[in-house]
């Protein structure tokens, strides 16, 4: 480091220095003032600095601050911004191999049911995108909606095929007999407990990493008060005030600086704390049911046991439902 | 073995891919994530620290400024300051946060409540409130497959995790559905997503 | 460790140029502004010039605008300080250091310095 400097006499160091920052002269004194007007950086004698400078001096401080916080955080923002993207990604690829899957199963194994059950479950999977990103749709309500779709279908197409066209107007009775005789048996409520809990928990892991984002955002750009900006000046430059260039800051008053200027964002840190460890809880407990990759990539056999299941009762339920929804037969005949 | 879409197919082609070695998951992947952000875990209280590690501090040097004047750097002028005439620390501190922190720390205890509530004991079994026809689930064993119901035919296993890209050498499309195509498409390349 | 060390001083000739050089290591050279500043015989420091760690923004103290040139080269982890017209005045050891990220604040390193004289 340079030998110490001799008094300035002058304050032309202070104004090389304050160049700095701010081009042009006209702020810093010639030569030392008494800087009775000074507000931060006050003065035990003479003093290079004006009210001026020290405006500047704030503003620079704050920024600095700004940036310094920024570029702390900087890390852990793209971690989790990167992470949110992959995830978000990952759990739509999953959801198209899933909607694939299912939609290959029904073309290889009934390829009767075609291209009506490509459209259902094409809706299907769409409504669990947008579960997914946060849309307000019951995931009951999609599974049954599925069901109900498919089975008039299933029902002209592989129970009763011979069935005439005039009789296929009984669609609305036959969605009523599906639930009203569990034509599919326990398969629906089975899919609608593993879907719903494992979207639930994808959904909110999602939503944890977003607002994860949106925590380091609202820390990153917070404006700090006045009064930091005054402890900041006077640690980092009203030294230059007294030509002492080259001196730093003393680390233990850096650290009472920065605590009392990060005093709010300090209160984030319990809670910031419980967030990483229940992320961890949540992300322990992501099998099984609560993986969604898990269940939805074995929907399509689910799907195709619940229709198996329908087949192996045909006799039984082509009885039953005659007799439900011979009304709505004869009234197409008349 | 895994039950597939391509065990379903009517001429039952089953498709030979080669076995992909360190294969990266979506569970492993959130794993490291955790891991990763476990790091990160004093982040807000270590932030006073880290700024003052990250802008001048006097490290070797025997002087330093404490805000007034030059002092030793070890010696008790060195973090007390004047600050008694500026402005109080203490009521500073006191002030409290700005209401954007408030508003996040809000947010925050919503989230937390949220992911409390969802995360689930670990080890618990599937809800067996099956079909009445005695289907059943039970416990799968320790291989890394998971299972997800069960069906007259036995239990279904799924393999785990995106171990279903690797396997798949194709998005399974409906026009080249396996059976009709063993031909990988160009929309392999999404497969990278997950790879660092 | 961070080190900086300062080359290419000399004696030259009132109207005289000469080129200073300053090897930075033991640091990210490319993402730090640097400094030159200058000390005259039993004078106090004088800041003379800064670039940026892109080398795409420059800065000078008014009394060697347009005779002072600073300049980088970050694959060669060096700052260099081109000084043509020379005059008596410019006569002072020239320091290179590290700007902190503390805008205009304390540098955070500085090298040993190199002695300039201007003399007839």
């Known amino acids: 480091q340079p030998p110490p400097p001799p008094p300035d006499a002058t304050c032309h160091q202070v104004r090389s220095f304050f160049q700095r920052l701010q081009p042009g002269l006209k702020w810093v004194p010639e030569t030392p003032v008494p800087g009775s007007d000074l507000q931060v950086c006050l003065p035990k004698g003479p003093t290079c600095c004006s009210r001026k400078m020290e405006e500047k001096y704030q503003l620079t401080a704050r920024l600095n601050m700004e940036q310094l916080l920024q570029s702390a955080s900087m890390e852990l923002k793209f971690l989790i911004i990167q992470n949110a993207a992959v995830f978000q990604e990952a759990f739509e690829i999953v959801v198209r191999h899933a909607k694939n899957y299912t939609n290959a199963m029904f073309k290889n194994n009934y390829p009767s049911l075609t291209p009506q059950a490509f459209e259902f479950v094409g809706e299907f999977f769409t409504d669990v995108s947008l579960y997914i990103l946060g849309s307000d749709i019951n995931v009951d309500d999609m599974v049954n909606e599925l069901f109900d779709s498919l089975f008039p279908v299933i029902y002209t197409q592989l129970m009763n095929p011979g069935l005439p066209d005039s009789a296929l107007d009984i669609n609305e009775c036959l969605r009523g007999a599906r639930r009203d005789l569990k034509v599919f048996g326990n398969f629906p409520k089975l899919i609608m407990t593993q879907v719903s809990k494992s979207l639930q928990v994808t959904r909110i892991f999602l939503q944890a990493l977003n607002l994860g984002i949106e925590v380091i955002n609202t820390t990153d750009h917070l404006k700090f008060s006045k009064d930091c900006g005054r402890m900041l000046t006077r640690m980092w430059y009203c030294s230059y005030c007294q030509g002492l260039m080259m001196v730093k800051p003393c680390g233990g008053y850096c650290n009472v600086v920065m605590q009392g200027c990060m005093a709010g964002v300090v209160e984030i840190d319990k809670y910031w704390r419980e967030y990483i460890l229940s992320l961890e809880e949540l992300v322990n407990g992501m099998y099984r049911i609560y993986d969604m990759e898990n269940v939805l990539l074995g929907l399509f056999s689910t799907i195709h046991d619940s229709i198996q299941y329908v087949q192996k009762n045909a006799g039984k339920l082509t009885t039953t439902i005659g007799k439900l929804c011979a009304h709505s037969q004869q009234r197409q005949y008349r | 073995s895994a039950y597939y879409p391509e065990d379903l197919f009517i001429d039952k082609k089953v498709l030979k891919v080669a076995h992909v070695e360190h294969e990266e998951t979506l569970s492993s992947r959130r794993r490291e994530l955790i891991q990763k952000l476990k790091s990160f875990i004093s982040f807000y209280s270590a932030l006073p620290g880290y700024i003052c590690s990250h802008s001048p501090v006097a490290e070797n040097d025997t002087l330093c400024w404490n805000g007034q004047e030059l002092v030793e750097r070890y010696s008790q002028k060195a973090a007390r300051n004047g600050m008694k005439n500026q402005f109080n620390l203490h009521e500073l501190k006191m002030k409290g946060p700005e209401p954007v922190v408030s508003q996040i720390i809000d947010k925050l205890k919503h989230i937390n409540q949220l992911l409390r509530t969802m995360s689930m004991p670990k080890g618990r079994v599937l809800d067996k409130n099956l079909d009445e026809e005695g289907f059943e689930s039970g416990d799968c064993g320790d291989d890394e497959d998971e299972c997800i119901g069960g069906s007259g035919d036995g239990m279904i296993k799924v393999k785990n995790q995106l171990r279903f890209l690797a396997e798949l050498a194709y998005d399974l499309d409906v026009d080249d559905a396996p059976g009709n195509s063993q031909q990988a498409t160009p929309k392999d390349n999404e497969i990278s997503t997950f790879h660092n | 460790q961070v080190q900086l060390v300062e080359s290419g001083g000399g004696l030259v000739q009132p109207g005289g140029s000469l080129r200073l050089s300053c090897a930075a290591s033991?640091?990210?050279?490319?993402?730090?502004?640097m400094s030159w500043v200058r000390q005259a015989p039993g004078k106090g420091l004088e800041w003379v010039s800064a670039i940026s760690g892109s080398g795409g923004s420059t800065n000078y103290v008014d009394s060697v605008k347009g005779r002072f040139t600073v300049s980088r080269d970050n694959s060669k982890n060096t700052l260099y300080l081109q000084m043509n017209r020379l005059r008596a005045e410019d006569t002072a050891v020239y320091y290179c250091a590290k700007e902190s990220m503390v805008r205009g604040g304390p540098f955070d390193y500085w090298g040993q310095g190199t002695l300039v004289t201007v003399s007839s």
């Open positions: 033991g640091f990210t050279f490319s993402s730090s502004a």
